[in-house]
Interface confidence: low
């Protein structure tokens, strides 16, 4: 079953998924898609990283973390009931039928407050800073040679709530791991 | 062709406000995020505030925190600043500044000429 | 005062390179990949000359390089032209979501 995270109305939503690159620069191609994830692919793409960058994003979904590390957990700005749904994270590993999944359920509560508007509202009141300890950034363009022996070593997304309030590296400990190879 | 153009700069008394706009083309404003920068007379370039693509996320330098509103709307391709409580130090050429992506950590590869503000009594 | 030190001017001769530096923290230019450089002409906006530390904005040309170690930045102009006397700006992306110029060199081309 998907892990359940939640947000209100207006609020960003915060979706963690990670995974660790076997060396600095060898990345792995990365989608996030609304829906549960299909055997390929990611359906109705928001945001897609390729082994150099971010190729493709649309204006509400963004990375919050520094995915030249692995952290790919999707930000999506000024949610509306409309963003409830599942969303699939797909670490897409060299190789056939090697791709790790990970449908994640985001549930949008009406606000119980009127909010400010968000376009003038300060990420860290929203979002505490606890929960974006590292920059966020585009992957380096570097010539990268075969991707096959990545031999990743870990892949994990997180089981907590984003209520939780715990550092994101502490949510990254807790995650589930998966080993390659 | 990308092009950022700001006016609504002036001089205004310590204590007042302005607000700034930048009208942008030639590129998808709502897939960028965007800055203000500022150069003091005969200084050096400083960082203002930043707004992510979406709009919902915005970062403030600590000079001007809790005086300064950054938005934008999207629907006219317009960034804005809000500039309340003017102090002298304020007084600068205001740049507007597209980032290459929606990423804070990204550089700006697009700038507009600058509007002046100057503050003074 | 800048977090980000640059020296304020160097000078070089035509057809010879010239290096500026830009030292900063663990929390900004040591941080991450994400210094940038700016070239600025008397009277103009700055240019975006190299992002990611080391890549090259369009339309740059390779005489421009950059390179970073550590806390320190580089940038590295070679082949220097009569033009490329301007201000030169280095900026970091830092750990706590804000953005840091440095100071600016002033590049005089002999």
């Known amino acids: 079953s998907e892990v359940e995270y939640r947000a209100e109305v207006g609020q960003n939503a915060y979706l963690p998924c990670f995974y660790t690159p076997a060396a600095p620069g060898n990345l792995v191609p990365v989608c996030w898609g609304k829906g549960a994830c299909p055997v390929f692919e990611c359906g109705n793409v928001v945001l897609r990283t390729d082994e150099r960058d971010v190729n493709y994003w649309t204006s509400r979904y963004w990375l919050n973390g520094d995915f030249r590390k692995g952290d790919v957990s999707l930000t999506i700005e000024n949610v509306t009931l409309a963003d409830s749904g599942i969303y699939c994270c797909r670490i897409q590993i060299p190789g056939i039928m090697n791709d790790e999944k990970f449908n994640l359920k985001l549930v949008i509560k009406p606000a119980k407050v009127t909010p400010a508007p968000t376009r003038q509202r300060d990420f860290t009141a929203a979002f505490p800073r606890m929960l974006t300890t590292r920059g966020h950034g585009p992957a380096e363009t570097q010539t990268l040679g075969s991707l096959p022996d990545i031999n990743l070593t870990q892949i994990s997304t997180l089981a907590n709530e984003l209520r939780d309030s715990r550092l994101a590296n502490d949510l990254r400990d807790s995650g589930a791991t998966i080993r390659i190879g | 062709q990308v092009q950022l153009q700001e006016s609504g700069g002036g001089l205004v008394q310590p204590g007042g406000s302005l607000t700034l706009s930048c009208a942008a083309s030639?590129?998808?404003?709502?897939?960028?995020?965007m800055s203000w920068v500022r150069q003091a007379p005969g200084k050096g370039l400083e960082w203002v505030s930043s707004?992510?693509?979406?709009?919902?996320?915005?970062y403030y330098a600590d000079s001007v925190k809790g005086r300064f509103t950054i938005s934008r709307d999207s629907a006219k391709n317009t960034l804005v600043l809000q500039m309340n409580s003017l102090k002298p130090e304020d007084t600068a050429v205001y740049y507007c500044?597209?980032?290459?992506?929606?990423?804070?950590?990204?550089?700006?590869?697009?700038w507009g000429q600058g509007t002046q503000v100057t503050v003074s009594s | 005062h800048s977090a980000v030190t640059q020296p304020p001017s160097v000078s070089g001769s035509p057809g010879k390179a010239v290096t500026i530096s830009c030292v900063g923290s663990?929390?900004?230019?040591?941080?991450?990949?994400?210094v940038s450089w700016y070239q600025q002409l008397p009277g103009m906006a700055p240019k975006l000359l190299i992002y990611?530390?080391?890549k090259r904005a369009s339309g740059i040309p390779d005489r421009f390089s950059g390179s970073k170690s550590g806390n320190t930045a580089s940038l590295t102009i070679s082949g220097l032209q009569s033009e490329d006397e301007a201000d030169y700006y280095c900026?970091?992306?830092?750990?706590?979501?804000?953005?840091?110029f440095g100071g600016g060199t002033h590049l005089a081309v002999l």
């Open positions: 500044a597209k980032k290459r992506q929606n990423f804070w950590s990204e550089g700006y590869d697009s």
């Open positions: 990611d530390v080391e």
């Open positions: 900026a970091s992306y830092r750990s706590d979501s804000n953005f840091v």
């Open positions: 707004i992510s693509a979406g709009g919902g996320t915005s």
């Open positions: 663990s929390s900004d230019v040591g941080y991450g990949d994400y």
């Open positions: 030639g590129f998808f404003f709502s897939s960028y995020a």
